[in-house]
């Protein structure tokens, strides 16, 4: 273990006004996942609703790099390679937890943050609104 | 703020042997996400690779409830409602961070954990292996 250095202006654990604060061991445990998973393989190319992966980077956040899916087409790709605009490619989104230093520059004080990321795309039948 | 109750046997922040431990503020900030997003809407029903959502609940984990997608079919649903087995429904997976109480039942002591979750399904062209 290490003795945690105190930066002036950084909250300390004895402060009773420190909001909803817990101790977290940062030795990440890998459950049902290897340290080097194959990220959903090459589905982004083989899908009927293919997507591109864009790098979302923020060094003040952990993880610092998050790959965001952006659907390539409005429609879905047919067997012949053409796009069928009677169907829709839509992003599948998920909320994930990230860590952010707070206050910034404090080495051992963090805040959990929830962000919404697009993980991939799926092909759906559109909702058709009929006008009376 | 709240006064943190001490359970006997639970580590406290002053323990210098507490491994790689930091303070984390659990007042979660929602960035670009509502507190109750419609999880990718009703895509799980409208998709050509539809999925069921299974509730994975664990009171020792935060978040305690995680919804896992299970693809309904091996193949993909065609416009006529029949399943095309020349295509494959596959899960889109994402590694996410969660907090696990450690030691168990301690209210304010956690360990970071990485788990692999299936977020939804997408329809892909199968990889065909030709036998010589």
């Amino acid at each position: 273990g290490i003795a945690i250095p105190r930066n002036s202006g950084c909250p300390n654990s004895e402060d009773k006004n420190f909001p909803r604060t817990v101790m977290v061991n940062l030795n990440i445990h890998n459950r049902n996942t290897s340290t080097n998973p194959k990220r959903s393989s090459d589905y982004y190319n083989r899908s009927t609703s293919p997507w591109n992966l864009h790098r979302n980077e923020d060094p003040e956040r952990y993880p610092s790099v998050i790959w965001e899916a952006k659907c390539r087409h409005l429609g879905c790709v047919k067997a012949d390679g053409n796009v069928d605009y009677h169907m829709n490619s839509v992003p599948i989104q998920q909320e994930i937890l990230v860590l952010r230093r707070e206050p910034r520059h404090c080495p051992n004080s963090f805040r959990l943050e929830k962000i919404l990321v697009s993980v991939g795309c799926t092909c759906v039948t559109p909702i058709v609104h009929h006008v009376a | 703020g709240i006064a943190i109750p001490r359970n006997s046997g639970c580590p406290n922040s002053e323990d210098k042997n507490f491994p790689r431990t930091v303070m984390v503020n659990l007042n979660i900030h929602n960035r670009n996400t509502s507190t109750n997003p419609k999880r990718s809407s009703d895509y799980y029903n409208r998709s050509t690779s539809p999925w069921n959502l299974h509730r994975n609940e664990d009171p020792e984990r935060y978040p305690s409830v995680i919804w896992e997608a299970k693809c309904r079919h091996l193949g993909c649903v065609k416009a006529d409602g029949n399943v095309d087995y020349h295509m494959n429904s596959v899960p889109i997976q994402q590694e996410i961070l969660v907090l696990r109480r450690e030691p168990r039942h301690c209210p304010n002591s956690f360990r970071l954990e990485k788990i692999l979750v299936s977020v939804g399904c997408t329809c892909v062209t199968p990889i065909v292996h030709h036998v010589a």
């Epitope: 940062l26 080097n36 998973p37 610092s64 998050i66 | -």
Partner: antibody
Framework: QVQLQQSGPGLVKPSQTLSLTCAIS??????????WGWIRQSPSRGLEWLGR?????????DYAVSVKSRITINPDTSKNQFSLQLNSVTPEDTAVYYC??????????????WGQGTLVTVSS | EIVLTQSPATLSLSPGERATLSCRAS???????LAWYQQKPGQAPRLLIY???NRATGIPARFSGSGSGTDFTLTISSLEPEDFAVYYC??????????FGQGTKVEIK
């Protein structure tokens, strides 16, 4: 098991281009969970990261600021290898050059597999 | 650019002794992106520790890592003859910021 095999000349003249190749076995240059990088080592500079390539639906190239204007890293998917080109070399570019696999799983980043190293001397 | 300063530059110890190597960053780095390597003469560096405290595959339990923020430590609990080498720390802050420390040489006393 993953292995990296480097090849390329050990002597390059000043102002010319340094070219090295790294052949991958046991993994793919197009892997979506790795990046492929070049690192050099000299007594004066120590270990210095030069750049990487990674494939995530398209190729991403990241280069160190110190060599950005002179460096190119290219993949060759047909041969499952990647290459380093460093233009306009000077004697300060004399170093042992390593190729390496960078595990890039979003939650970790580290070099777990290294090539054997190639001593490149820049001299006329 | 983040500078990693390793100390001491040289550590003279006998087999069986405990080695404590320090790596200090010029600004906060995520511990998850901090790694340690061992290098022997004429060889490429070898990964020992990733994520500041996780032992790489095949690395003996006598090697351990700790630290967060700006201060990180590699500890070899009881030196074996094959442990005498140069040790480097490395950080990844962003896709364009990846740096190594200058190294600590562990030599036989």
């Amino acid at each position: 098991q993953v292995q990296l095999q480097q090849s390329g000349p050990g002597l390059v003249k000043p102002s010319q281009t340094l070219s090295l190749t790294c052949a991958i076995s046991g993994d793919s240059v197009s892997s979506s969970s790795a990046a492929w990088g070049w690192i050099r080592q000299s007594p004066s500079r120590g270990l210095e990261w030069l750049g990487r390539i990674s494939y995530r639906s398209k190729w991403y190239n990241d280069y160190a600021v110190s060599v950005k204007s002179r460096i190119t890293i290219n993949p060759d998917t047909s041969k499952n290898q990647f290459s380093l080109q460093l233009n306009s070399v000077t004697p300060e570019d004399t170093a042992v050059y390593y190729c390496a696999r960078e595990v890039d799983s979003m939650y970790y980043s580290y070099f777990d597999i290294w090539g054997q190293g190639t001593l490149v001397t820049v001299s006329s | 650019e983040i500078v990693l300063t390793q100390s001491p530059a040289t550590l003279s110890l006998s087999p069986g002794e405990r080695a404590t190597l320090s790596c200090r960053a010029s600004q906060n780095v995520w511990a998850f992106y901090l790694a340690w390597y061992q290098q022997k003469p004429g060889q490429a560096p070898r990964l020992l520790i990733y994520g500041a405290s996780n032992r790489a595959t095949g690395i003996p339990a006598r090697f351990s890592g700790s630290g967060s923020g700006t201060d990180f430590t590699l500890t070899i609990s009881s030196l074996e003859p094959e442990d005498f080498a140069v040790y480097y720390c490395q950080q990844y802050r962003s896709t364009l910021s990846l740096t190594f420390g200058q190294g600590t040489k562990v030599e036989i006393k």
